[in-house]
Protein backbone atom coordinates (compact mmCIF):
# COMPACT_ATOMS: atom_id res chain seq x y z
CA UNK A 1 0.00 0.00 0.00
CA UNK A 2 2.96 2.36 0.40
CA UNK A 3 4.25 3.90 -2.79
CA UNK A 4 7.97 4.40 -3.06
CA UNK A 5 8.66 7.66 -4.87
CA UNK A 6 12.12 6.82 -6.09
CA UNK A 7 12.80 10.29 -7.43
CA UNK A 8 12.51 11.65 -3.89
CA UNK A 9 14.53 8.96 -2.14
CA UNK A 10 18.22 8.37 -2.12
CA UNK A 11 20.14 5.10 -2.22
CA UNK A 12 17.07 2.86 -1.98
CA UNK A 13 16.07 4.24 1.41
CA UNK A 14 13.44 2.21 3.20
CA UNK A 15 10.70 3.25 5.57
CA UNK A 16 12.76 1.81 8.42
CA UNK A 17 15.88 3.76 7.54
CA UNK A 18 13.89 6.98 7.23
CA UNK A 19 12.11 6.45 10.54
CA UNK A 20 15.41 5.69 12.25
CA UNK A 21 16.73 9.12 11.30
CA UNK A 22 13.70 11.36 11.82
CA UNK A 23 15.60 14.27 13.27
CA UNK A 24 15.75 17.13 10.82
CA UNK A 25 12.75 18.87 9.29
CA UNK A 26 13.85 17.54 5.93
CA UNK A 27 13.66 14.00 7.32
CA UNK A 28 10.02 14.58 8.24
CA UNK A 29 9.17 16.01 4.83
CA UNK A 30 10.79 13.05 3.12
CA UNK A 31 8.97 10.64 5.45
CA UNK A 32 5.54 12.16 4.81
CA UNK A 33 6.15 12.09 1.07
CA UNK A 34 7.38 8.51 1.23
CA UNK A 35 4.16 7.54 2.98
CA UNK A 36 2.05 9.36 0.45
CA UNK A 37 0.15 6.25 -0.64
CA UNK A 38 -3.27 7.87 -0.74
CA UNK A 39 -2.38 10.93 1.37
CA UNK A 40 0.45 12.97 2.84
CA UNK A 41 0.17 11.35 6.25
CA UNK A 42 0.16 7.97 4.68
CA UNK A 43 -1.59 4.78 3.91
CA UNK A 44 -4.50 3.78 1.75
CA UNK A 45 -7.93 3.75 3.24
Amino acid sequence: KHKCFRNSLENNETLESIMNTLESEEDFRKYFYYLEGSKGGGGSK
Epitope: N7, L22, E25, G41, G42, G43
Partner: antibody, heavy 114, light 113 residues
Framework: QVQLVQSGAEVKKPGASVKVSCKAS????????VSWVRQAPGQGLEWMGW????????NYAQKLQGRVTMTTDTSTSTAYMELTSLRSDDTAVYYC???????WGQGTLVTVSS | DIQMTQSPDSLAVSLGERATINCKSS????????????LAWYQQKPGQPPKLLIY???TRESGVPDRFSGSGSGTDFTLTISSLQAEDVAVYYC?????????FGQGTKVEIK
Protein backbone atom coordinates in the same frame (compact mmCIF):
# COMPACT_ATOMS: atom_id res chain seq x y z
CA GLN B 1 -10.43 1.19 8.57
CA VAL B 2 -8.13 3.42 10.55
CA GLN B 3 -9.41 4.18 14.04
CA LEU B 4 -7.99 6.03 17.02
CA VAL B 5 -9.94 5.49 20.24
CA GLN B 6 -9.13 7.64 23.25
CA SER B 7 -9.68 7.19 26.97
CA GLY B 8 -12.50 8.92 28.82
CA ALA B 9 -12.88 12.36 30.33
CA GLU B 10 -10.82 13.32 33.38
CA VAL B 11 -11.23 15.89 36.14
CA LYS B 12 -8.01 16.90 37.89
CA LYS B 13 -6.91 19.34 40.53
CA PRO B 14 -4.24 21.98 39.84
CA GLY B 15 -0.75 20.51 40.26
CA ALA B 16 -1.88 16.98 39.44
CA SER B 17 -1.00 14.90 36.38
CA VAL B 18 -3.13 13.30 33.69
CA LYS B 19 -2.38 10.46 31.30
CA VAL B 20 -4.53 10.06 28.19
CA SER B 21 -4.43 6.95 26.01
CA CYS B 22 -5.05 6.51 22.30
CA LYS B 23 -5.53 3.00 20.91
CA ALA B 24 -4.88 2.65 17.20
CA SER B 25 -6.24 0.05 14.80
CA UNK B 26 -6.61 -0.48 11.06
CA UNK B 27 -3.01 0.27 10.09
CA UNK B 28 0.55 -0.75 10.89
CA UNK B 29 1.08 1.17 14.11
CA UNK B 30 4.88 1.23 13.96
CA UNK B 31 4.99 2.74 10.47
CA UNK B 32 3.52 6.00 11.69
CA UNK B 33 3.80 8.54 14.45
CA VAL B 34 1.15 10.02 16.71
CA SER B 35 0.61 13.71 17.31
CA TRP B 36 -1.23 15.19 20.24
CA VAL B 37 -3.28 18.34 19.72
CA ARG B 38 -5.36 20.17 22.28
CA GLN B 39 -8.25 22.59 22.03
CA ALA B 40 -9.26 24.83 24.93
CA PRO B 41 -12.99 25.61 25.20
CA GLY B 42 -14.05 27.84 22.31
CA GLN B 43 -10.47 28.13 21.07
CA GLY B 44 -8.38 26.87 18.17
CA LEU B 45 -6.06 23.89 17.77
CA GLU B 46 -2.66 23.69 19.46
CA TRP B 47 -0.09 21.08 18.45
CA MET B 48 1.57 19.57 21.52
CA GLY B 49 4.07 17.18 20.01
CA TRP B 50 4.70 14.00 18.09
CA UNK B 51 6.06 10.56 18.91
CA UNK B 52 7.35 7.90 16.54
CA UNK B 53 5.66 4.56 17.16
CA UNK B 54 8.64 2.99 15.41
CA UNK B 55 11.34 3.93 17.90
CA UNK B 56 9.80 6.28 20.46
CA UNK B 57 11.56 9.42 19.23
CA UNK B 58 9.69 12.53 20.33
CA ASN B 59 9.32 16.12 19.18
CA TYR B 60 7.58 18.36 21.73
CA ALA B 61 6.22 21.87 21.42
CA GLN B 62 8.63 24.19 23.21
CA LYS B 63 5.84 25.64 25.35
CA LEU B 64 5.21 22.25 26.96
CA GLN B 65 8.78 20.98 27.26
CA GLY B 66 9.34 19.55 30.73
CA ARG B 67 5.64 19.02 31.44
CA VAL B 68 4.62 16.65 28.65
CA THR B 69 5.73 13.07 28.05
CA MET B 70 4.59 10.97 25.12
CA THR B 71 5.05 7.22 25.00
CA THR B 72 3.85 4.25 22.99
CA ASP B 73 3.18 0.58 23.68
CA THR B 74 3.63 -1.30 20.44
CA SER B 75 2.26 -4.53 21.93
CA THR B 76 -1.16 -2.90 22.24
CA SER B 77 -0.81 -0.24 19.49
CA THR B 78 -1.48 2.44 22.05
CA ALA B 79 -0.03 5.92 22.43
CA TYR B 80 -0.03 7.85 25.70
CA MET B 81 0.29 11.50 26.57
CA GLU B 82 1.04 12.54 30.15
CA LEU B 83 0.86 16.16 31.22
CA THR B 84 2.12 17.13 34.67
CA SER B 85 1.78 20.16 36.95
CA LEU B 86 -1.67 20.83 35.59
CA ARG B 87 -3.04 24.37 35.60
CA SER B 88 -6.50 25.72 34.92
CA ASP B 89 -5.45 26.80 31.43
CA ASP B 90 -4.69 23.15 30.60
CA THR B 91 -8.45 22.55 30.57
CA ALA B 92 -9.08 21.39 27.01
CA VAL B 93 -10.11 18.57 24.73
CA TYR B 94 -6.99 16.53 23.96
CA TYR B 95 -6.85 14.76 20.60
CA CYS B 96 -4.47 12.18 19.25
CA UNK B 97 -3.91 12.10 15.52
CA UNK B 98 -1.90 9.95 13.17
CA UNK B 99 1.29 11.72 12.10
CA UNK B 100 0.42 15.31 11.24
CA UNK B 101 -3.32 14.72 11.35
CA UNK B 102 -4.80 12.52 8.64
CA UNK B 103 -6.86 10.57 11.20
CA TRP B 104 -8.01 11.80 14.62
CA GLY B 105 -9.27 10.30 17.84
CA GLN B 106 -12.61 11.38 19.25
CA GLY B 107 -11.02 13.59 21.88
CA THR B 108 -10.64 13.46 25.66
CA LEU B 109 -11.89 16.32 27.82
CA VAL B 110 -9.50 17.14 30.64
CA THR B 111 -10.88 19.59 33.19
CA VAL B 112 -8.50 21.17 35.70
CA SER B 113 -10.37 22.69 38.59
CA SER B 114 -9.93 23.08 42.31
CA ASP C 1 7.74 28.74 14.15
CA ILE C 2 5.60 29.15 11.04
CA GLN C 3 2.59 31.36 11.73
CA MET C 4 -0.64 30.55 9.92
CA THR C 5 -3.13 33.40 9.48
CA GLN C 6 -6.63 32.80 8.16
CA SER C 7 -9.05 35.35 6.78
CA PRO C 8 -11.77 36.14 7.40
CA ASP C 9 -12.40 35.04 10.99
CA SER C 10 -16.04 34.40 10.12
CA LEU C 11 -18.05 34.20 6.94
CA ALA C 12 -21.80 34.20 6.27
CA VAL C 13 -22.78 32.82 2.87
CA SER C 14 -26.16 32.06 1.32
CA LEU C 15 -27.01 28.44 0.55
CA GLY C 16 -25.72 27.51 -2.88
CA GLU C 17 -23.25 30.38 -2.97
CA ARG C 18 -19.46 30.24 -2.98
CA ALA C 19 -17.42 30.47 0.24
CA THR C 20 -13.73 31.34 0.10
CA ILE C 21 -11.29 31.08 3.01
CA ASN C 22 -7.72 32.30 2.80
CA CYS C 23 -4.68 31.06 4.68
CA LYS C 24 -1.28 32.74 4.70
CA SER C 25 1.89 31.20 6.14
CA SER C 26 4.72 33.30 7.52
CA UNK C 27 7.18 31.35 5.37
CA UNK C 28 6.90 29.07 2.39
CA UNK C 29 5.63 25.53 2.97
CA UNK C 30 6.62 24.42 -0.53
CA UNK C 31 9.32 21.75 -0.50
CA UNK C 32 11.41 22.18 -3.63
CA UNK C 33 12.61 18.55 -3.66
CA UNK C 34 9.16 17.22 -4.51
CA UNK C 35 7.25 20.41 -5.39
CA UNK C 36 4.68 19.66 -2.68
CA UNK C 37 3.02 22.18 -0.41
CA UNK C 38 2.80 20.75 3.11
CA LEU C 39 -0.58 22.32 3.81
CA ALA C 40 -3.84 20.72 4.95
CA TRP C 41 -7.40 21.94 5.47
CA TYR C 42 -9.79 20.62 8.12
CA GLN C 43 -13.47 20.99 8.91
CA GLN C 44 -14.58 20.88 12.54
CA LYS C 45 -18.16 20.71 13.71
CA PRO C 46 -19.16 21.28 17.35
CA GLY C 47 -18.30 18.36 19.62
CA GLN C 48 -16.35 16.55 16.90
CA PRO C 49 -12.67 16.18 16.06
CA PRO C 50 -11.31 17.95 12.98
CA LYS C 51 -11.94 16.13 9.71
CA LEU C 52 -9.31 16.22 6.98
CA LEU C 53 -10.64 17.76 3.76
CA ILE C 54 -7.55 18.65 1.72
CA TYR C 55 -3.84 17.75 1.92
CA UNK C 56 -0.83 18.74 -0.17
CA UNK C 57 -2.76 22.05 -0.50
CA UNK C 58 -5.01 20.78 -3.27
CA THR C 59 -5.58 17.02 -2.99
CA ARG C 60 -9.10 16.18 -1.83
CA GLU C 61 -9.38 13.51 0.82
CA SER C 62 -11.29 10.39 -0.14
CA GLY C 63 -15.01 10.81 0.43
CA VAL C 64 -14.94 14.61 0.60
CA PRO C 65 -17.53 16.21 -1.73
CA ASP C 66 -16.06 17.83 -4.82
CA ARG C 67 -17.54 21.21 -3.89
CA PHE C 68 -14.49 21.50 -1.61
CA SER C 69 -11.28 22.49 -3.34
CA GLY C 70 -7.90 23.79 -2.28
CA SER C 71 -5.45 25.95 -4.20
CA GLY C 72 -2.35 28.04 -3.75
CA SER C 73 1.36 27.53 -3.32
CA GLY C 74 4.24 28.82 -1.25
CA THR C 75 2.68 31.08 1.35
CA ASP C 76 -0.84 31.81 0.09
CA PHE C 77 -3.62 29.24 0.06
CA THR C 78 -7.37 29.14 -0.45
CA LEU C 79 -10.13 26.73 0.48
CA THR C 80 -13.22 27.12 -1.69
CA ILE C 81 -16.67 25.67 -1.11
CA SER C 82 -18.25 26.11 -4.53
CA SER C 83 -21.87 25.76 -3.45
CA LEU C 84 -22.46 26.01 0.29
CA GLN C 85 -24.71 23.35 1.80
CA ALA C 86 -26.34 23.42 5.24
CA GLU C 87 -24.04 20.62 6.44
CA ASP C 88 -20.98 22.75 5.64
CA VAL C 89 -21.61 25.02 8.63
CA ALA C 90 -18.45 24.50 10.69
CA VAL C 91 -15.09 25.97 11.61
CA TYR C 92 -12.35 25.47 9.03
CA TYR C 93 -8.64 25.32 9.85
CA CYS C 94 -5.52 25.30 7.73
CA UNK C 95 -2.39 23.56 9.02
CA UNK C 96 1.20 23.40 7.86
CA UNK C 97 3.16 20.19 8.32
CA UNK C 98 6.30 21.50 6.65
CA UNK C 99 8.15 22.31 9.84
CA UNK C 100 7.63 21.47 13.51
CA UNK C 101 5.75 22.68 15.39
CA UNK C 102 3.01 21.81 12.92
CA UNK C 103 0.87 24.89 13.32
CA PHE C 104 -2.76 25.72 12.64
CA GLY C 105 -4.54 28.84 11.55
CA GLN C 106 -6.89 30.42 14.07
CA GLY C 107 -9.95 29.06 12.28
CA THR C 108 -12.72 30.50 10.11
CA LYS C 109 -16.34 30.06 11.14
CA VAL C 110 -18.69 29.52 8.20
CA GLU C 111 -22.37 30.23 8.70
CA ILE C 112 -25.49 30.46 6.57
CA LYS C 113 -26.62 33.96 5.60
Amino acid sequence: QVQLVQSGAEVKKPGASVKVSCKASGYTFTSYGVSWVRQAPGQGLEWMGWISAYNGNTNYAQKLQGRVTMTTDTSTSTAYMELTSLRSDDTAVYYCARNWGDYWGQGTLVTVSS
Amino acid sequence: DIQMTQSPDSLAVSLGERATINCKSSQSVLYSSNNKNYLAWYQQKPGQPPKLLIYWASTRESGVPDRFSGSGSGTDFTLTISSLQAEDVAVYYCQQYYSTPWTFGQGTKVEIK
